[in-house]
Structures are given as structure tokens and as C-alpha cells.
């Protein structure tokens, strides 16, 4: 059965999965994608790593970990209702059958509402400003190709302003890991 | 064209093995999985396992672990399907599929399929 | 092993007819893990539908995919004399990948 995790509408979801790589640099693909694992690789993919690089991602989904030491825990930026479900982490170890996959049940509560004092509220409380690495046009989808001006430095330091870290390190210590090697 | 051309057909005693080749073309080798699915004579389709020709790893049917081996040459954009212990039961039409999965199209379904190599284990 | 059991067994129609083939699976399966396949006499079997509802290239509009969960349908809106063969559905979300045991569709 799936390991549950409980975030608020609003709010960053993070999913940990973590791997230890057999020697430093020598990365594994990861895949996540929506919904439970299937036979191979992930469907409805939302991130996946090669052996180098985060080479495709979809937006509001991020690794704000240092993935090159095997921490690939996916943060869910801004999350909605319709984020609930069953979410793929997969690493993709080479050889016969030895993907390892974990299957993370994300429940998205609502937000909880507090009764303004007054009639007139505060704006800001109500809509805090967002971090954003966006900016790039329409694209749903896009990969570290099309994002010449943001590298992934960038992208995990203004992801990280917006994980909450106390439950970062809360769910980092239940997070499913495995070691490579 | 997208093609995958298989090797002929086979007649093989019980408990030999036979190696069944299928050879890629008209696109990128490495950039999609490959199956092996069996038809016994008027039956249906059983999958048998898979091959990811880019790093050669595989995954195999429960049924056939151990005596299934999936390999691939990619010099020549080939991948392999061994059996080995044959027994009558074995004897089917064996087909390489093409899986739609690459980069950037996360979908699954085998969309390119060999012509099929007829496998006779009969002593 | 999730099994996939295809209804009917045969199905009996005319050209111009609407035919729709049911698949159950004996758990839940993503529809993103449901495909549909058809197969003629001698030949290999051609992708018709994946992620359940998608046609695959070259697939006339008159087939389509549905459902959800545990049942599934393709359906063919108006059959035309090519159309009679075996069709499967498959699942690609548990291991091993497994197909349905095939509706044969025929000339009534």
C-alpha cells in the first residue's frame, strides 16, 4: 500500500523518495509521473532525470533536493485538489528487473479559512506573493533546452524559498530510500 | 518507413532453444522499448518481456524468468529474444513490438509490430 | 496478474452496424495503461487505441475508446467490411503486461 502525505491547497506537497548513488556523479535516470507505477517508466510523467541532468519537467513540479546525491523528493508548487492521487517515483537502475518503484499517496486538504476581523481584508495575507522561475511563454511543458536563461542552480534556490522546510525535514526521515552499490 | 524485420522460422527439438532476431529501421534504435509478445496457435497474445535497447536493461514475464534472455546489438539495431528448455507448449508465433513510450510522449501501446517468427518444437 | 476479460466472445453484426466490445479488468488499471489492438487472420496485431480513448496514427475516427477504473469499451460507429477481426484490450499496469482473450467480431 502507499505511504501517505498531506498537504494544504495553497500550500508546496513534498514527496520524498531518495537513492544513494554508487559513487558521486554516477546518476540514475528517476522518473514521477501521476498515478501508481506501471510495468516500466512512469506515465503521465511530471519530471524525469537522466543520468546528468533533470531533462524534462512540467510546471509547478520540482526537485528542489540535491538530486546529484540521490535526493530526487519531488516538491508540487501551489497545490490544488485536483493534485490528490497516487504519484510514481521510480529509479531506474540498470540491469534485469531492478527499477525500484514507490507508489506516494499525495491527499490535498482545503485550505483552512480564517474569518477576517473586518470586512475590508488584508490582500496580501489572502494571496501571498508567489516565487516563480516561469516566464518563458505558454509552454505547459518544457525542458532545461528551452530555459536558457535558468540553470538549475537558480531553479533549486528559488524552489527552495518556497518549500516549507519543517516539514521537509519532518517527512525526509519517512521518505523511501534506497541505496545503489 | 518504421520497420521491424524478424528471422525465419524455426523447428527445434524439446528442451533445445532458439534465438529469434528483430531488426530495427526508419528510426532511432535506442529511443524506444521494445517487446516480445507469443500467439500459440489459435490463441491469444501473451506478453513475454521487455528490453529498453538504449541501456539493455530488461523485465520478464514471471512465467519466463529464467528461461527468457532479451538482448539487443545496437550496431546493427537489433534486439534478440532467447528460449531456452523448450517443450510443445512452446510453439507459437513470436512477435517484437515497438512500444509508442519515448521522451517527451509518455503514452503506452505497441505500435510497430514484426511480421512474426514461427517457432515448431516437435520431436 | 491483473486479468482482462473481453465480452462478447463473438460478436455477430452487418457492415453499417455499431459495435461495442467491453474489457473488465479484475483491478483497477489506470487509463493511461489501456490499450486496444486488432487482428486479422495472418497477420500481426495493429494499435488502434492507447491511454484508452487516444486513436493511434492512421486510425479511422469511427473507432473510439472509453472508460475508466475496471470497464472499458471500444466502439466502432458504423463497421465497414475490413473491420471483421479479433480485437484486444491490454494493460500495462501491473506486471506482466496482459491481454484481454480477444473479441471475434464477424460478418453476420
Known amino acids: 500500500s502507499e505511504v501517505e502525505y498531506r498537504a494544504e491547497v495553497g500550500q508546496n506537497a513534498y514527496l520524498p523518495c531518495f537513492y544513494t548513488p554508487a559513487a558521486p556523479g554516477n546518476l540514475v535516470p528517476v522518473c514521477w509521473g501521476k498515478g501508481a507505477c506501471p510495468v516500466f517508466e512512469c506515465g503521465n510523467v511530471v519530471l524525469r532525470t537522466d543520468e546528468r541532468d533533470v531533462n524534462y519537467w512540467t510546471s509547478r513540479y520540482w526537485l528542489n533536493g540535491d538530486f546529484r546525491k540521490g535526493d530526487v523528493s519531488l516538491t508540487i508548487e501551489n497545490v490544488t485538489l485536483a493534485d490528490s492521487g497516487i504519484y510514481c517515483c521510480r529509479i531506474q537502475i540498470p540491469g534485469i528487473m531492478n527499477d525500484e518503484k514507490f507508489n506516494l499517496k499525495l491527499v490535498i486538504k482545503p485550505a483552512k479559512v480564517t474569518p477576517a476581523p473586518t470586512r475590508q481584508r488584508d490582500f496580501t495575507a489572502a494571496f501571498p506573493r508567489m516565487l516563480t522561475t516561469r516566464g518563458h511563454g505558454p509552454a505547459e511543458t518544457q525542458t532545461l533546452g528551452s530555459l536558457p536563461d535558468i540553470n538549475l542552480t537558480q531553479i533549486s534556490t528559488l524552489a527552495n524559498e518556497l518549500r516549507d522546510s519543517r516539514l521537509a525535514n519532518d517527512l525526509r526521515d519517512s521518505g523511501a530510500t534506497i541505496r545503489i552499490g | 518507413q518504421v520497420q521491424l524485420q524478424q528471422s525465419g522460422a524455426e523447428v527445434k527439438k524439446p528442451g533445445a532453444s532458439v534465438k529469434v532476431s528483430c531488426k530495427a529501421s526508419?528510426?532511432?534504435?535506442?529511443?524506444?522499448?521494445m517487446h516480445w509478445v507469443r500467439q500459440a496457435p489459435g490463441q491469444g497474445l501473451e506478453w513475454m518481456g521487455i528490453i529498453n535497447p538504449s541501456g539493455g536493461s530488461t523485465s520478464y514475464a514471471q512465467k519466463f524468468q529464467g528461461r527468457v534472455t532479451m538482448t539487443r546489438d545496437t550496431s546493427t539495431s537489433t534486439v534478440y529474444m532467447e528460449l531456452s528448455s523448450l517443450r510443445s507448449e512452446d510453439t507459437a508465433v513470436y512477435y517484437c513490438a515497438r512500444d509508442l513510450y519515448s521522451y517527451g510522449f509518455y503514452y503506452y501501446g505497441m505500435d510497430v509490430w514484426g511480421q512474426g517468427t514461427t517457432v515448431t518444437v516437435s520431436s | 496478474e491483473t486479468t482482462l476479460t473481453q465480452s462478447p466472445g463473438t460478436l455477430s453484426l452487418s457492415p453499417g452496424e455499431r459495435a461495442t466490445l467491453s474489457c473488465r479488468a479484475s483491478q483497477s488499471v489506470s487509463s493511461s495503461y489501456l490499450a486496444w489492438y486488432q487482428q486479422k487472420i495472418g497477420q500481426a496485431p495493429r494499435l488502434l487505441i492507447y491511454g484508452a480513448s487516444s486513436r493511434a496514427t492512421g486510425i479511422p475516427d469511427r473507432f473510439s475508446g472509453s472508460g475508466s477504473g475496471t470497464d472499458f469499451t471500444l466502439t466502432i460507429s458504423r463497421l465497414e467490411p475490413e473491420d471483421f477481426a479479433v480485437y484486444y484490450c491490454?494493460?500495462?499496469?501491473?506486471?506482466?503486461?496482459?491481454f484481454g482473450q480477444g473479441t471475434r467480431l464477424e460478418i453476420k
Open positions: 526508419g528510426y532511432t534504435f535506442t529511443s524506444y522499448y
Open positions: 491490454q494493460q500495462y499496469g501491473s506486471s506482466p503486461i496482459t
